[in-house]
């Protein structure tokens, strides 16, 4: 029960992470205009991973794309890689882990079959939530290097004739939400891996044993299957670590692909 | 077409408060700021500030700070500018803009204060 | 506050002549973010609302014609009539967009000779 809530509520927490690192890296405010040195501007700009924008005093927002691949900076590029691969690997992370989540049937899985793939969807929330939590930290890294830079150069002068206040860029919303996107991911992660641990079948220390009795030859075999029918059909052996505690008849019925328990 | 349709003429005495109305149409209403500005008799123009629909977010001129309230009503799109404690330097055609650039304008109304 | 100042306060040209009014602002208008000018050109009519004719420097608004043109950048700011028509008569504003409070300058009055 405890292995089921763990995977659950780590598969849960990973969708949230991941549905955060998707918004994140489409949200245009990876950078907001600091406003500490020109408080009363009629004009904001923002910057996202994608485009720039420009909220004016009518209200009106105007983004414009960076239609160029060359001309953008590598860490921007860099950036936009780690946040994409952060994105396709949990993508493909929560695939495996719907397919190897304890309270869904498919077929006659395995379980140790769910257990790895538990352990894989696990290692792939990791992965891409350190790919968030990098990505946005080696943006927000980026940033504090220009605003002191900025700082330190605050004015620049237009052809040497006009001068003019440098637009200093402080943390936007989205590295805020792609720090906790990419820690939700993370810990949804470790959950996945722990949870994995539970579904494991444990292996017996026992080799087999061939117990002889008068009339019936049975032979019982480690992994908890029987090896023969003397006992008649009343006894069903049940594999202990099955969560659907399918006996082997009901292996013979052919269940849906789905079977929802 | 954008349209923005101000009350009409107003006489009001020293001290009195009035309410100018701006109603809307043509646009969504909560895209865009709505500017108030002024312009005395033979005078040019003053801004005394904004409010957003949207979000209902407001910058006054600071000339005028404690003496305007602007305030709107999103489901008639009207915006209010109401100037208080009223002065005869206050006497002017009050006008609402909104758009890009100031694009559109109100038709303007007319406030005279006078004892 | 920035402070809007044109030139001339009147101008009185011929009619298919060049006008050529100035605006200067006490600060830069312009918009490192995405390069602009936040300076916005109006014309107004007696008895009329102002109507716009400039925003960001340069960019005509829509309807407006391209006789008018305006140019500039940081603090000096042209608007140019190409060849005046006696409908251009009017008071010209010139109005700092970038920074609040937003500020009008005082108007150039033209006419015509």
């Known amino acids: 029960m405890a292995v089921t809530a763990c995977q659950g509520l780590g598969f849960v927490v990973s969708l949230i992470g991941i549905a955060g690192i998707i918004a994140a890296t489409c949200m245009d405010q990876w950078s907001t205009q600091d406003l500490y040195n020109n408080p009363v501007t009629a004009v904001f700009n923002y910057q996202g991973l994608w485009r720039s924008c420009v909220r004016e005093s009518s209200g009106f927002t105007e983004c414009r794309g960076y239609f160029t691949l060359l001309g953008l900076p590598a860490m921007l590029q860099a950036v936009r890689a780690l946040m994409i691969v952060g994105i396709v690997l949990g993508a493909i992370g929560l695939l495996v882990s719907i397919f190897a989540l304890k309270c869904i049937r498919i077929g006659s899985m395995e379980d140790s079959a769910k257990a790895n793939m538990t352990l894989t969807s696990g290692i792939m929330f990791i992965v891409s939530g350190l790919c968030a939590i990098a990505g946005v930290s080696v943006f927000a890294n980026m940033l504090v290097t220009n605003f002191w830079m900025s700082t330190a150069n605050m004015y620049t002068g237009m052809g040497g004739m006009v001068q003019t206040v440098q637009t200093r860029y402080t943390f936007g919303a989205a590295l805020f939400v792609g720090w906790v996107a990419g820690g939700l991911t993370l810990i949804g992660g470790v959950m996945m891996c722990i949870a994995c641990r539970g579904l494991a079948p444990e292996e017996t220390n026992y080799k087999a044993v061939s117990y002889h009795a008068s009339g019936h030859s049975v032979a019982y075999k480690p992994g908890g299957f029987k090896a023969s029918t003397g006992f008649g059909s009343n006894t069903k052996n049940k594999k202990i670590y099955d969560g659907g505690a399918r006996t082997e008849d009901e292996v013979q019925s052919y269940p849906s692909k789905h079977d929802y328990v | 077409q954008v349209q923005l349709v101000q009350s009409g003429a107003e006489v009001k005495k020293p001290g009195a408060s009035v309410k100018v109305s701006c109603k809307a149409s043509g646009f969504t209403f909560t895209s865009y700021n709505i500017h108030w500005v002024r312009q005395a008799p033979g005078q040019g123009l003053e801004w005394i500030g904004y409010?957003?629909?949207?979000?209902?977010?407001?910058n006054y001129n600071l000339k005028f700070k404690d003496r305007a309230t602007m305030t709107s009503d999103t489901s008639i799109s009207t915006a209010y500018m109401e100037l208080s404690r009223l002065r005869s330097d206050d006497t002017a055609v009050y006008f609402c803009a909104t758009g890009r650039g100031f694009a559109y304008w109100g038709q303007g109304t007319l406030v005279t204060v006078s004892s | 506050d920035i402070v809007m100042t044109q030139s001339p306060d009147s101008l009185a040209v011929s009619p298919g002549e060049r006008a050529t009014m100035s605006c200067k602002s006490s600060?830069?208008?312009?918009?490192?973010?995405?390069?602009?000018?936040?300076l916005i050109w109006y014309q107004q009519k007696p008895g009329q609302p102002p109507k716009l004719l400039i925003y960001?420097?340069?960019t005509r608004d829509s309807g407006v014609p391209d006789r008018f043109s305006g140019s500039g950048s940081g603090t000096d700011f042209t608007l140019t009539i190409s060849s005046l028509q006696a409908e251009d008569v009017a008071v010209y504003y010139c109005q700092n967009d970038y920074s609040y409070p937003l500020t009008f300058g005082g108007g150039t009055k033209l006419e015509i000779k």
């Open positions: 600060q830069s208008l312009f918009n490192s973010g995405n390069q602009k000018n936040y």
């Open positions: 409010i957003s629909p949207g979000n209902g977010g407001s």
């Open positions: 960001r420097a340069s």
